[in-house]
Amino acid sequence: MAVTACQGLGFVVSLIGIAGIIAATCMDQWSTQDLYNNPVTAVFNYQGLWRSCVRESSGFTECRGYFTLLGLPAMLQAVRALMIVGIVLGAIGLLVSIFALKCIRIGSMEDSAKANMTLTSGIMFIVSGLCAIAGVSVFANMLVTNFWMSTANMYTGMGGMVQTVQTRYTFGAALFVGWVAGGLTLIGGVMMCIACRGLAPEETNYKAVSYHASGHSVAYKPGGFKASTGFGSNTKNKKIYDGGARTEDEVQSYPSKHDYV
């Protein structure tokens, strides 16, 4: 039950996170005009990854797309790439995780297959979240650098007579949406990975009881159908574990790829 809840919650959190990453990527307010300590203007500028906008106090808003690809700063291109990679990975992760959900039955899918899919989607969500956080952080760093550069030469003019106010940009709402969304996707991914451990074929944690009969030993596993029987010196190969009655052979028969989670 706890596994299903963890997996379900991880899915929902990731879904919200990816929706947020998509929203942040599409938003126009990645950077907004800094209003602090500036002359009050009747025009407000803000920029996104795909277009820049101007909102006049009259209410009229005009947006212009960045129609050039080669003319854009490399950093902006990198941020775009990171956000798109994050969205693509997240979308694939969501698709995979839908089929991995324990509450959904698809044919005769094994628990081990669901565990694999849960882990895969979890890793995808983690990478998706990291991509979004990295993209937003790169953009934020770019803004901070430009902000202090434009503050250094805030006013430029001829002999101080005619002044040109340089527009400074600060963090826009999209950055905060991106950070939160990236974090949620990351958390969702971690939750999926945690859920994966519990989805691996269940082990019965009963103490094994040994019954010794004359001439051979019998390892009896209560509640189970398998009884490991050995003769004479062969018994040493059939170790009885303290935590449960599994043989070395059985341990190796399960996929070991989940062991590191």
């Epitope: 203007t41 500028n45 006049e56 209410g59 009229f60 002044q163 040109t164 340089q166 527009t167």
Partner: antibody, heavy 118, light 113 residues
Framework: QVQLQESGPGLVRPSQTLSLTCTAS????????MSWVRQPPGRGLEWVAF????????EYNPSVKGRFTILRDNSKNQLSLKLSSVTAADTAVYYC???????????WGQGSLVTVSS | DIQMTQSPSSLSASVGDRVTITCKSS????????????LTWYQQKPGKAPKLLIY???NLQTGVPSRFSGSGSGTDFTFTISSLQPEDIATYYC?????????FGQGTKVEIK
């Protein structure tokens, strides 16, 4: 067509309070920001106050800030300007005007003369 | 406050003449976001309300005759009447529409010789 009609008391005594009203018709009032502009007799134009289309954002000329209040009632299609502690320097024709592209004032009322005299 | 300096304060010209008015602002009215200059030109006839002629420094308002034009960028702007007509007798104002408080030039009175 677009029409803006100002109305006011006309004559007022110094230090008194008065209110000017501008009634709009012929356009969706709630979609446009508005301003008041005044013109003292024989002088040039002076912008007085601005209000955004929703009424949440206002700006004032420093010469009137603290004394004048701009308000709007979108349900009644009305813009108002409350003038308090008036002086002879506030004597002017007061125009209400609509903002459009470029923040330009594309439509103006015919004006309302306010005379401050004892 | 942004100072708007208009020149000349008055001028007299003949019908058909080319009339030019200049307007200088104390700060640049060019917005970097859309590369537009927030300068507006108005015409005011005696006893009437002002009428919008040009916005964004060079955009002609709908219904305004094409003999009126505007140019300039940053801090220096020009308003031109290519061929003066009797009905153009009025006072012309430039306005800063970029910084609050929104400020007008002192006006240029155009008369017929």
């Amino acid at each position: 067509q677009v029409q803006l009609q100002e109305s006011g008391p006309g004559l007022v005594r110094p230090s008194q309070t008065l209110s000017l009203t501008c009634t709009a018709s012929g356009f969706t009032f709630s979609k446009y920001a508005m301003s008041w502009v005044r013109q003292p007799p024989g002088r040039g134009l002076e912008w007085v106050a601005f209000i955004s289309n929703g009424g949440s954002y206002t700006e004032y000329n420093p010469s009137v800030k603290g004394r004048f209040t701009i308000l709007r009632d979108n349900s009644k299609n009305q813009l108002s300007l409350k003038l308090s502690s008036v002086t002879a320097a506030d004597t002017a024709v007061y125009y209400c005007a609509r903002h459009d592209k470029g923040n330009a004032l594309d439509y103006w009322g015919q004006g309302s003369l306010v005379t401050v005299s004892s | 406050d942004i100072q708007m300096t208009q020149s000349p304060s008055s001028l007299s010209a003949s019908v058909g003449d080319r009339v030019t008015i200049t307007c200088k602002s104390s700060q640049s009215l060019l917005n970097s976001g859309n590369q537009k200059n927030y300068l507006t030109w108005y015409q005011q006839k005696p006893g009437k309300a002002p009428k919008l002629l040009i916005y964004w420094a060079s955009n002609l308002q709908t219904g305004v005759p094409s003999r009126f034009s505007g140019s300039g960028s940053g801090t220096d702007f020009t308003f031109t009447i290519s061929s003066l007509q009797p009905e153009d007798i009025a006072t012309y104002y430039c306005q800063n529409d970029y910084f609050y408080p929104l400020t007008f030039g002192q006006g240029t009175k155009v008369e017929i010789k």
